[in-house]
């Protein structure tokens, strides 16, 4: 696998973009130290490798953007991992500095004699990768070489702060605009008491952490929070599950800012701790609409309320992706291992046949299967045209009337590129309009997405509201059937007529127990009783005192 | 506390409903478990009903038992007794709303099966 | 499966002596094991929870051990009193399960 890793995709062009895609799965703790990666991924990996160089190849075929200048990438493997991430980044850079070192007549052999060989270009620019910790850690190097970042999915609110990230730009929204989402839905439904889960790095904690402090504000109270890496293993996970069990009943709604493996990790340990339908897991985008998540373990996921980045599918990618076979691909040095993978068999005779599989793959093998399209598609492209956009008015400002690379653009200067970049306005893939605040965040928009049961064995994602600009639409029948079906995850009842609430020392505000004001009392606040003063009784509804009426007693009245 | 009854001597085949019978316990809060244990012989789990009101089943059950619940009770249905299920069935408290351990036990149900 | 194994099935010590039970869990259960006594014609009685917490108005002569696989419970300072067989069951997984109780020892104080 660590040779695996050094496998690189190119596309030869006049201007090279580069692209970080977890084409693996990240490695697993016991293999981190070896940054030995997991298997293959479609949506993740080899989709969006199969996007990149698919998009350049519009773009190249596209006469109004950046004619008579050749889009080529190098795409790299993050396998969702900083070490690995950061191991590739370096590789980029290199490709960089011995290229401009040979601009400055730098290169020289070991003997002193001149060089005769062609370095690769430079990386002018890099698409991804998808994970905002990951993106940290990569945006921390290529800002050192004022290389331009454009993430498609790394939404970490601290990636906003232009003061140390001055590189990077995204097309998708921060963090802190679902934390707010996720909030409403909370409110909504008044779950006032619930517990909280998210993945370790940055953006479970940065996302966690507004979602908490939101819900302060709100009235809502925490149970307990918990965090957990991705990759951890079952026992891990089973701890954690029993440790939410905890706070049942009470706390039936767990919140969960994760990455979708962190879902599905919480998924296996109920199936394996009996604890499915116990909770209603209420998901951030690392969720979505994955299947990847729910696979084999839908029971467990009934219920779930996800958070989607609005992103609708791409079609034309789906019509190039699906006739794509291991035989014609070989641009794509991860097709066959991934082909493989797929179908579980063996390409017979290839480079890479995989022994470890006794059936031989077919020739009537087609992607068409049980085929789903990468939920953040969209995105992928759209930061790949962002860029092409960025160089197309960098040229324009730089060579105006000259059709192609002019001298004024070579090299590609980084700091110039941002600028152009920042400033960016075009139609993205879905019609929507993409553009850059100051801090190199896009607008966005949340799909609310329900994982329901929709007959026998049969389950899916629905639609069932939306989020945007601060407005959530939910259609509540949609998810909950009828009223009565409304899970309660609440610490306390409310307290009776005469009662008030009594918040047990350490205990969160949203627990009390209700205790009745004594007979000559009512009730002065939700927290405090009051004596009536002496000639005075409380009212029927305990809220006040009445004066007692003066009854005289005359000699003849009988005793009382 | 935890009663249960229902308990006597049924033929085979004949269907058997125990009754768990609870004060001062609040079943939306606690899970219950059943529990039974032949003469002689030591203690068999045979399910447990959660808070929420899903049930779990010892693998060995396979459709013989079949727990459920009201506010105040927790039913304990032999479907089709055989012999070997002649035995003192328990009901118990789980500390917990769904499994953990029993902190509070009823003193046992005697079933009896025989032709 | 989650299945428990104890050991012995039966042990016999004299008055003031010690006892020590064990109990093993088929695969890793943390510290989700719960020990309890059983007298005979009674229902069993909560010793020990979560493998070494104490419960309620149980004598400290009793203590519990272990996390993983392999638990084990002590009686110290042996009385008439704790004649009875002792079992354990595992609180971590209702999946899977033939049978939550271990086969129970039975302890006999001479």
């Known amino acids: 696998q660590s040779s695996e890793r050094r496998v690189v995709a190119h596309m030869p062009g006049d201007i090279i973009i580069g692209a970080l895609f977890s084409v693996h799965h990240q490695p697993t703790v016991d293999k981190v130290h070896e940054r030995k990666c997991g298997a293959v991924r479609e949506q993740y990996g080899i989709q969006r490798v199969e996007a990149m160089l698919h998009t350049l190849e519009r773009i190249n075929s596209d006469p109004t953007l950046l004619p008579n200048i050749t889009l080529g990438c190098e795409i790299r493997d993050s396998c969702w991992h900083s070490a690995v991430a950061l191991e590739q980044s370096i590789e980029f850079i290199r490709d960089s500095l011995i290229s401009s070192e040979e601009e400055e007549g730098l290169v020289r052999c070991v003997d002193g004699s001149s060089s005769s060989f062609r370095s690769k270009k430079p990386i002018v620019g890099v698409i991804g990768p998808g994970s905002s910790s990951v993106a940290i850690q990569v945006q921390n190097l290529l800002q050192l070489f004022n290389i331009p970042q454009i993430a498609y999915s790394a939404t970490s609110m601290d990636l906003s702060d232009k003061t140390l990230f001055k590189y990077f730009m995204r097309v998708v929204p921060s963090d802190a605009q679902q934390a707010r989402a996720m909030v409403d839905i909370v409110k909504r439904y008044n779950w006032t008491y619930v517990s909280a889960v998210h993945t370790e790095g940055n953006y479970g904690e940065s996302g966690m952490e507004a979602f908490k402090d939101m819900s302060a504000k709100e009235g809502i109270c925490i149970a307990h929070s918990y965090k957990i890496y991705s990759n951890a293993g079952e026992q891990s996970f089973d701890k954690l599950l029993k440790k939410l069990t905890s706070h049942l009943p009470k706390a039936r709604v767990v919140a969960c800012f994760c990455e979708g493996m962190t879902v599905r990790g919480l998924l296996m340990a109920m199936r394996r701790l009996g604890l499915a339908g116990e909770f209603l897991l209420l998901g951030s985008d690392g969720w979505a609409d994955r299947y990847d998540v729910t696979d084999g373990y839908q029971r467990e996921a009934v219920g779930g309320i996800t958070i989607k980045l609005q992103s609708p599918d791409v079609k034309w990618f789906d019509d190039y992706y699906l006739k794509l076979r291991p035989e014609t691909n070989h641009r794509n040095p991860w097709f066959q291992e991934f082909w493989q993978h797929r179908f579980q068999c063996r390409l017979e005779g290839f480079p890479q046949e995989n022994s470890k599989y006794n059936k031989t793959c077919n020739s009537s093998l087609t992607l068409k299967t049980h085929h789903v399209q990468d939920s953040k598609m969209g995105f992928v492209i759209n930061a790949i045209y962002s860029m092409a956009y960025g160089l197309h008015n960098m040229q324009m400002s730089l060579c105006p009337g000259y059709a192609g690379l002019c001298d004024a653009m070579k090299p590609i200067d980084g700091r110039k590129l941002l600028e152009s970049l920042m400033k960016t306005n075009f139609t993205g893939v879905s019609g929507d309009t993409i553009l850059f605040d100051e801090n190199g965040d896009s607008p966005g928009r949340y799909e609310i997405m329900n994982f329901k049961e929709m007959g026998k064995d049969y389950f899916d994602y629905i639609n069932v509201g939306s989020w945007d600009n601060g407005e959530l639409k939910m259609d509540d029948d949609e998810v909950w059937s009828k009223k009565s079906n409304i899970i309660r995850s609440v610490c306390s009842e409310p307290c009776e007529k005469g009662q008030i609430k009594v918040i047990r020392k350490g205990e969160v505000s949203c627990c009390w127990t209700c205790t009745p004001c004594k007979e000559n009392e009512y009730v002065f606040d939700e927290y405090t009783c009051k004596a009536c003063q002496l000639g005075s009784w409380p009212t029927d509804d305990l809220t006040g005192c009445d004066l007692i009426p003066v009854q005289y007693l005359r000699w003849g009245d009988p005793e009382p | 506390s935890v009663e249960e009854s229902g308990g006597r001597l049924v033929t085979p085949g004949t269907p058997l409903t125990l009754t768990c019978t609870v004060s001062?316990?609040?079943?939306?809060?606690?899970?219950m478990g059943w529990v039974r244990q032949a003469p002689g012989k030591g203690l068999e789990w045979i399910g447990i009903?959660?808070?929420?009101?899903n049930a779990w089943y010892a693998n060995w059950v396979k459709g013989r038992f079949t727990i459920s619940k009201t506010s105040t009770t927790v039913d304990l249905k032999i479907t089709s007794p055989t012999t070997e299920d002649t035995a003192t069935y328990f009901c118990?408290?789980?500390?917990?709303?769904?499994?953990?351990?029993?902190?509070?036990w009823g003193q046992g149900t005697l079933v009896t099966v025989s032709s | 499966a989650y299945d428990m194994t104890q050991t012995p099935s039966s042990v016999s010590a004299a008055v003031g002596g010690t006892v020590t039970i064990k109990c093993q869990a088929s695969?890793?259960?943390?510290?989700?094991l719960s020990w309890y006594q059983q007298k005979p014609g009674q229902p069993p009685k909560l010793l020990i929870y979560?493998?070494?917490t104490l419960a309620s108005g149980v004598s400290s002569r009793f203590s519990g051990s272990g996390s993983g696989t392999e638990f084990t419970l002590t009686i110290s300072d042996l009385e008439c009193a704790d004649a009875a067989t002792y079992y354990c069951?595992?609180?971590?997984?209702?999946?899977?399960?033939?049978?939550?109780f271990g086969g129970g020892t039975e302890v006999v104080v001479k």
């Open positions: 118990a408290r789980d500390a917990t709303a769904t499994w953990d351990y029993f902190n509070l």
């Open positions: 001062g316990i609040d079943l939306s809060s606690n899970a």
């Open positions: 009903i959660y808070a929420s009101g």
């Open positions: 695969q890793s259960i943390s510290n989700w």
């Open positions: 979560r493998a070494s």
């Open positions: 069951q595992q609180g971590y997984s209702v999946a899977n399960v033939d049978n939550a």
